[in-house]
Interface confidence: low
């Protein structure tokens, strides 16, 4: 049942004498393993014996494998899957069909395969793609029908004969499918591959040459182009005329137009393979080429650079920077066409020449404010000298120049006084726009550049303005040497160190901080009566009767300012004590008595002790004794002593008088 | 050194007044004058007013004209500060800085807030 | 009135970084502006006046530039301490003062 056998493997194998062919194949057989298996070279089927007739290359049966030509033929499948054939090597006269006779247990199979067995190797074939246009990579293929384990080959490209330089990829199959040797080459033509032989070389293990095939390149490119010129060297003198011509060495396809260009640009009507200029102006310099296009696309010449000869044309000046800044670099620079370019230059400022400046640049690395004005220049090649043309203007900027701080009052100022102040400059560039002084203050500025201190301070001591316009410049202070009145005048006592007590050598100090003008007068003067015009007043020994309310005062030629009134304080011990008696000296028994001890002491006294006429302290120490109710015993002579922390004083006897009253004198 | 001292903190109710001191020292204090500038919670900062300490001359902000009022003591070398019909908007730092044009020398700022 | 445009508002920056901050006048301010810096909780602190003067005790890192209506503070290579709020305040109009509203300069 033949639709139980299922056979896969190349149709046809392809080899040549010697080689060997390798015979990938697969089957199936449904009924059960194989049990013998027959390889014919060319079968017949014998209708009479119901067998093959044939050449039996390869044979096995159930007993084991026959040897056959001494193992060229292998098998090496297996009972069920593989059928896989290898002849080694293979011989002319095996080209023809090849049959598989396979049975099984039940069935029988004969499975034919062609074997094509030519005399020499045969050539390889290129495959290239339908169109190869320059600079465009491609892909070269050359295949062979043709692999086998024990055979090994390679593919080798080559370029008019010569191995070419670009990594080939060869890759083979030896599959049921296929059967094959591949080599791709990646490449990427140039238009000067056109036209070139590309061959495709099969070569042995060793490198000896089997077979090739060979392509010639079709490159499809622009056209290539030559340009000539004459004068060959493309210089010429106003005037003088010029011949281009154009040369086609390679196109594919044919091309079809022809133009000219200048500077990018194409000439008009100029559509053939020369181009002629007459009598040419210096406007005709620039860069030629000619372009010719074919279907691939436009292709041009390398530029011919046509330079037309001319005297410098009248020059300009450029200025790095204008306006510059006083101090800095500023560059010229002469500006003039010419062809050739100028080898000389000469350069005026404000009409002069500037000696010594023969270059087209001049750098003045420090710019002062003479360096201001107008710059010019001429420039001058091998055919003339141009003329100047209107030169630029530097203008050198630089901050307001010897500015001065100038005090408009009469001298001197005084406190209190409007000064009035005005800055002054030199020069400045550009104009001074505004003013700053120094110190700030809340002044008034009634106009540019002046100020105004109203009630000018007596510490006021200098100012400074400054002109500005994109800069500030400032002046040196100037002193406004304010005068003033004696200020912070004080008494300051300067013996003794410690409090002052009676008796004491006692000296006072009229200070004061400052005054201007400095010359001075002092005067001192107490309760409104004047007491000396020295800084100091002295006291040889001082007296109670000193203390009280002194005031210096210090005048110059401005004023006079007077201290705070200072309190002067003598320390000394009671005195002037004396004994009063209250209601009086007479009083009756069993009345009341007071006695006071009164005296003038400084600091105030701070304890009282009371004596009688026997000298006996009594048991009193305040200022008052209050005796109540008063008894004739009472009568006599007191007195109080009183101390403070100076010393002590005593009082004289003053003597008390109690007499009897009616009653008393009535029960007598 | 030059100082600027501002008063303490102060929290207001809408529609109240708030007076901000500002105390100079280590300078002559009438040579100057003093600018405020506050500073809303992290909004920019932005300029009220000045007053001259020598003249007493003022020049406010256009948005506070009829609202704030610049003094000065030059008695004690003190500058001060009074925001009138405080809304809420108003909660800010507000500091003084002695006035050159550029700032040199600032306070140290008073938060004042405005709650109700 | 003078505004003052300050960009960009915040600035993204590595220690060791340069930072370049913009200030723009709707009108010419000459010279007159002045730079400051102010960190949380604290007065601004005058960096540059004149445009390009550095206040007394400003490192050299600090440096201010242009004129008329375009003006620049750079910091050469910030510093940890250096990351603030910068302030631009033009007083060509003293005593009436303008401040633009702050470039925030931030680690990255």
């Known amino acids: 049942d033949s639709s139980k056998w299922v056979f896969e493997h190349p149709e046809t194998l392809y080899a040549w004498e010697g080689a060997c062919v390798w015979i990938p194949c697969t089957y199936r057989a449904l009924d059960g393993d194989l049990e013998s298996f027959i390889l014919f070279h060319n079968p017949e089927y014998n209708k009479n014996t119901s067998k093959f007739d044939g050449t039996r290359l390869y044979e096995s049966t159930k007993d084991g494998k026959v040897p056959s030509e001494q193992k060229r033929v292998q098998f090496l499948g297996d009972k069920n899957k593989n059928c896989t054939l290898s002849i080694h090597p293979v011989h002319l006269n095996d080209s023809g069909q090849l049959g598989l006779r396979m049975e099984s247990k039940t069935e029988k199979w004969m499975e034919r395969i062609h074997l094509n067995v030519s005399e020499r190797p045969f050539p390889p074939h290129i495959q290239l793609p339908p169109e190869i246009q320059e600079s465009q990579e491609v892909t070269l293929t050359c295949l062979l029908n043709f692999s086998c384990y024990g055979y090994p080959i390679q593919l080798q490209w080559l370029l008019e004969g010569v191995p070419m330089r670009q990594a080939a990829v060869t890759s083979t199959s030896l599959t049921i499918k296929s059967v094959f040797t591949r080599s791709e080459l990646k490449f990427s033509p140039q238009w000067s591959h056109h036209g070139k032989i590309v061959t495709c070389q099969l070569q042995d293990a060793d490198g000896k040459f089997l077979s090739n095939d060979t392509v010639q390149l079709n490159v499809k490119h622009t056209p290539k182009l030559e340009i000539k010129v004459t004068p060959s060297d493309a210089i010429v003198r106003e005037g003088d005329s010029v011949t281009m011509t154009c040369e086609v060495s390679s196109s594919n396809p044919e091309y079809t137009t022809v133009s000219w260009l200048k500077d990018g640009t194409s000439l008009k009507k100029q559509n053939t393979f020369t181009l002629n200029l007459r009598e040419v102006t210096k406007d005709q310099s620039g860069k030629y080429c000619c372009q010719v296009s074919n279907d691939v696309g436009p292709g041009r010449s390398e530029e011919v650079f046509l330079q037309v000869q001319y005297a410098p044309e009248p020059s300009t000046v450029q200025i790095l920077h204008s306006p510059a800044v006083e101090g800095s670099q500023v560059e010229f620079l002469c500006m003039s066409l010419a062809n050739p370019l100028p080898t000389n230059y000469t350069w005026y400022h404000n009409g002069k020449e500037m000696q010594g400046r023969t270059e087209e640049k001049v750098h003045i690395p420090k710019i002062l404010p003479w360096h201001a004005g107008t710059y010019s220049c001429v420039a001058e090649n091998i055919l003339g000298t141009g003329q100047r043309g209107p030169g630029a203007e530097l203008d050198v900027q630089y901050p307001p120049k010897k500015v001065t701080t100038v005090i408009q009052n009469p001298m001197p100022i005084r406190e209190g006084d409007t000064v009035t102040l005005s800055c002054n400059y030199n020069s400045s560039n550009p104009s001074v726009t505004r003013y700053e002084w120094k110190p700030h203050g809340a002044w008034e500025e009634p106009s540019l550049g002046v100020l105004k201190i109203q009630n000018v301070g007596w510490d006021n001591t200098t100012i400074a303005c400054a002109a500005c316009n994109s800069w500030c410049s400032w002046a040196s202070p100037v002193a406004l040497n304010v005068q003033y009145a004696p200020r912070d005048v004080r008494v300051r006592k300067i013996k003794p160190l410690s409090e002052i007590h009676s008796g004491n050598s006692v000296s006072l100090q009229c200070d004061f901080s400052s005054s201007h003008p400095k010359e001075v007068q002092f005067f001192w003067e107490k309760n409104g009566r004047l007491l000396g015009k020295e800084s100091q007043l002295n006291f040889d020994s001082i007296s109670p009767e000193d203390a009280g309310s002194y005031s210096c005062w210090v005048n110059n030629s401005i004023g006079q300012t007077a201290s705070k009134a200072w309190t002067l304080e003598v320390l000394y011990a009671p005195r002037r004590l004396r004994v009063s008696m209250s209601p009086g000296d007479q009083v009756m028994e069993g009345k009341s008595a007071t006695l006071t001890c009164e005296s003038d002491a400084n600091p105030p006294v701070s304890h009282y002790t009371w004596f009688d006429w026997n000298n006996q302290s009594l048991p009193y120490h305040s200022q008052k004794l209050r005796l109540e109710p008063v008894k004739v015993q009472h009568s006599g002579a007191y007195w109080c002593q009183g101390t403070n922390s100076v010393g002590k004083g005593r009082s004289p006897l003053s003597t008390l008088t109690v007499y009897y009253s009616p009653e008393t004198i009535g029960r007598r | 050194q030059v100082q600027l001292v501002q008063s303490g903190a102060e929290v207001k109710k809408p529609g109240a007044s708030v007076k901000v001191s500002c105390k100079a020292s280590?300078?002559?204090?009438?040579?100057?004058?003093i600018s405020w500038v506050r500073q809303a919670p992290g909004q920019c900062l932005e300029w009220m007013g000045w007053i001259s300490a020598y003249n007493g001359k003022t020049s406010y902000a256009q948005k506070f004209q009829g609202r704030v009022t610049m003094t000065t003591d030059t008695s004690t070398g003190t500058a001060y500060m009074e925001l009138r019909s405080l809304r809420s908007d108003d909660t800010a730092v507000y500091y003084c800085?002695?006035?050159?044009?550029?700032?040199?020398?600032w306070g140290q700022g008073t938060l004042v807030t405005v709650s109700s | 009135e003078i505004v003052m445009t300050q960009s960009p508002a915040t600035l993204s920056v590595s220690p060791g970084e340069r930072a370049t901050l913009s200030c723009r006048a709707s009108?010419?301010?000459?010279?007159?502006l002045a730079w400051y810096q102010q960190k949380p909780g604290q007065a601004p602190r005058l960096l540059i006046y004149g445009a390009s003067t550095r206040a007394t005790g400003i490192p050299a890192r600090f440096s201010g530039g242009g004129s008329g209506t375009e003006f620049t503070l750079t910091i050469s290579s910030l510093q940890s301490e250096d990351f603030a709020v910068y302030y631009c305040q033009q007083y060509h109009t003293w005593p009436v003062l303008t401040f633009g509203c702050g470039t925030k300069v931030e680690i990255k």
């Open positions: 280590g300078y002559t204090f009438n040579n100057y004058g």
């Open positions: 800085a002695r006035s050159t044009g550029d700032g040199e020398y």
């Open positions: 009108q010419s301010v000459s010279s007159n």
